[in-house]
């Protein structure tokens, strides 16, 4: 097991998850750790505890390894980091990779007020409701590098979007969370259409793909006090 030392260390590796950092309960996920071609061992840590290791074969000139989690559960959801060893030296820790398990327990309802098709500048609010006890709700936009939002609430949360712009158009889903890394099933999608303005056309996403595997996320700061944490939502984290 890696010995902590603040002396000489190698550059930190890059860690990412494929196909996504959001994994349906029971599905598999690959965690990649990219270090150096000279690395003799990679170690993966989960919530600060040693999780797995791999010793690359010298015959393969690869600077990364893949750790395979065969069945994602609430027990494997959380924060992962990796290290690598080259010679006698260990690298610094990678940035944290936060894996979320979805598809737990129940499915929330999502709706939008006043309606799914609104004019540019109109005030819009999303509502997410989940019957089972939860304390936090997440609203996600498909295919967006726009922000994910979260709100605290018992059974229901509202997400005021303010006066909408064209950037708000797209398809949304919400989740209830049982902790930061264990989420409900996704709601049915709600597509927000924006009309009026210069182009005066209903703008919905042209890409019909709605698989979570293709979503990109960013976490915004809001009144709940959560700071923006791009490492959580980017598939790859570095620097």
């Amino acid at each position: 097991q890696r010995i902590n030392t603040e002396k000489e260390t190698l550059p930190k590796p890059i860690i990412w998850a494929k196909p996504s950092i959001m994994v349906t309960n029971g599905n598999s996920v690959n965690i990649w750790c990219q270090g150096a071609q000279s690395a003799s061992e990679y170690q993966l840590y989960f919530e600060g505890s040693f999780f797995a290791l791999e010793r690359p074969k010298p015959s393969r000139s690869m600077n990364k390894v893949r750790f395979f989690i065969s069945q994602m559960t609430s027990h494997t959801a959380g924060i992962y980091t990796c290290f690598y060893q080259s010679g006698e030296l260990w690298s610094k820790s990678s940035n944290p990779l936060k894996l979320v398990v979805t598809g737990l327990y129940d499915t929330p309802n999502l709706w939008v007020y006043p309606r799914p098709e609104v004019t540019l500048g109109e005030n819009v609010t999303f509502f997410c409701q989940l019957k089972t006890a939860t304390s936090k709700f997440f609203l996600l936009k498909e295919r967006g590098s726009n922000h994910i939002q979260n709100k605290y609430g018992n059974i229901q949360a509202e997400f005021p979007m303010g006066p909408v712009t064209r950037a708000h158009r797209g398809t949304y889903r919400c989740f209830g969370s049982y902790n930061d890394y264990a989420w409900s099933f996704p709601s049915e999608p709600v597509t927000l259409l924006i009309t009026g303005g210069v182009e005066n056309s209903s703008l919905a996403p042209t890409d019909p793909t709605s698989s979570l595997d293709y979503w990109e996320f960013d976490l915004s700061t809001n009144e709940s006090g959560l700071q923006k944490d791009s490492a959580f939502w980017d598939h790859t984290t570095q620097n």
């Epitope: 989960f46 505890s49 999780f51 797995a52 791999e54 010793r55 065969s70 069945q71």
Partner: nanobody, 127 residues
């Protein structure tokens, strides 16, 4: 579905040896990474040793390094734990566990990674 059945446990004197076996059912054994864990009375389950699916890379807990050896026979769908120089503190129920399927030469140390477990076999070390 994978079923794991441990055998070979028993009572032994300090300094003695035992070999535990874990027989796996199904055709997925060759694609499984395997591990041994143990749980002493009143204590949490702890990692003992693990082996990768293909080339047989191994990893051991510091407490057993140099005394225990993990190995596998893919033709027999069996993983072994050879235990020697046994001590009183090795007394525990020993569990075999599998990660099915897995990839490459991953060696899993954390119990959360394992998705199949045996029922355990008791090892008692006493004079």
């Amino acid at each position: 579905e994978v079923q794991l059945v441990e055998s070979g446990g028993g009572e032994v004197q300090p300094g003695g040896s035992l070999r535990l076996s874990c027989a796996a059912s199904g055709r997925t054994f060759a694609s499984a990474a395997m591990g041994w864990f143990r749980q002493a009375p009143g204590k949490e389950r702890e990692f003992v040793a693990a082996i990768s699916r293909s080339v047989g890379d191994t990893y051991y807990a510091d407490s057993v390094k140099g005394r225990f050896t993990i190995s596998r026979d893919n033709a027999k769908n069996t993983v072994y734990l050879q235990m020697s120089s046994l001590r009183a503190e090795d007394t525990a129920v020993y569990y075999c566990a599998a990660v099915v399927p897995t990839y490459g030469n991953n060696i899993y140390v954390h119990s959360a990674a394992y998705n199949y477990w045996g029922q355990g076999t008791l090892v008692t070390v006493k004079p």
